[in-house]
């Protein structure tokens, strides 16, 4: 079925929401004054070998649990991430974007990445897909 302008618009909005969530996480933790940043950087994330289509979001979905675990370290009184809620929201968006019709087996790169590299990769992915839709 060819995508309609309304479905394209919906996809774009969902990607923009995902992008904002990922940027919010990155901005919240990637601050040189963050006392826990060096320890957060000891956690390793799997990166997709290829991320050019919405189906590749399967690779992001599979890393959401480890992401939540690291975000549990990122809270402060003035920065309420509420990791469980945030990851749940991202999960809903990812599921809708990648679709559940086809089962895609994610292929990961050999090298693991830090949380900062991981977030930047998926931010770049989201921006790239959005640019093809607009």
């Amino acid at each position: 079925m060819a995508p309609t302008s309304s479905s394209t618009k919906k996809t774009q909005l969902q990607l923009e929401h995902l992008l904002l969530d990922l940027q919010m996480i990155l901005n919240g933790i990637n601050n040189y004054k963050n006392p826990k940043l060096t320890r957060m950087l000891t956690f390793k994330f799997y990166m997709p070998k290829k991320a050019t289509e919405l189906k590749h979001l399967q690779c992001l979905e599979e890393e959401l649990k480890p992401l939540e675990e690291v975000l549990n370290l990122a809270q402060s009184k003035n920065f309420h991430l509420r990791p469980r809620d945030l990851i749940s929201n991202i999960n809903v968006i990812v599921l809708e974007l990648k679709g559940s019709e086809t089962t895609f087996m994610c292929e990961y790169a050999d090298e693991t990445a830090t949380i900062v590299e991981f977030l930047n990769r998926w931010i770049t992915f989201s921006q790239s897909i959005i640019s093809t839709l607009t």
Partner: antibody, heavy 121, light 111 residues
């Protein structure tokens, strides 16, 4: 009971290698980072470095970078601190400790009993 | 690295005394409203034991006679009524910036 049990005292000669251990029990070992702290005779505490047993990721105090290696074997819930060539100045008590960093905090809540390392010719 | 200066470095006290130990940081150890300053007790031949975390939170199982206060660069550990088992060395630690650093220690001896 949550505990960290360290290997026994060591007496070594300068130039020798050494690997001491810290075994965690009573909790999910890969869910917490392990820190290493040095205490030279009659002195205070110095933080050396940290390891994430789940990923193997490490971070060192610049003072100890290149002097020691921190590693872990998650299959046996054990973290290690090792030297390739000991010096007399490495004589000290070495502690491992569990890092807690959820929420708004960051502290060492459980400590090993310590391993005494004596380096003398 | 952040330097922590404890005072006094040692002193004598009697059981029942109210004891106050101070820890001064070379720069603020606060981040977004939280103080990353902890207190530990160490007895001879033993490992340090956590007493207070985040400046004022009492670790589970630690007697309520221990309390902590302060923010920014100035912190205090107070023992409201010194008991015989409290004679030990006390260390403050900052966990706001790497490398984590400890104060030089304050030894509390029997008068």
């Amino acid at each position: 009971e949550v505990q960290l049990v360290q290997s026994g005292a060591e007496v070594k000669k300068p130039g020798e290698s050494l690997k001491i251990s810290c075994k965690g029990s009573g909790y999910a070992f890969t869910n917490y980072l392990i820190e290493w702290v040095r205490q030279m005779p009659g002195k205070g505490l110095e933080w050396m470095g940290v390891i994430n047993p789940g990923s193997g990721g490490t971070y060192y105090n610049e003072k100890f970078k290149g002097q020691v290696t921190i590693s872990a074997d998650k299959s046996i819930s054990t973290a290690y601190l090792q030297w390739s060539s000991l010096k007399a100045s490495d004589t000290a008590m070495y502690y491992c400790a569990r890092w807690r960093g959820e929420g708004y905090y960051a502290y060492f809540d459980v400590w090993g009993q310590g391993t005494t390392v004596t380096v003398s010719s | 690295a952040i330097r922590l200066t404890q005072s006094p470095s040692s002193f004598s006290a009697s059981t029942g005394d109210r004891v106050t130990i101070t820890c001064k940081a070379s720069q603020s150890v606060d981040y977004q409203g939280d103080s990353y300053l902890n207190w530990y007790q160490q007895k001879p031949g033993k490992a340090p034991k956590l007493l207070i975390y985040s400046a004022s939170n009492l670790e589970s199982g630690v007697p309520s006679r221990f309390s902590g206060s302060g923010s920014g660069t100035d912190f205090t550990l107070t023992i409201s009524s010194l008991q015989s088992e409290d004679f030990a060395t006390y260390y403050c630690q900052q966990s706001n910036e790497d490398p984590y650093t400890f104060g030089g220690g304050t030894k509390v001896e029997i008068k």
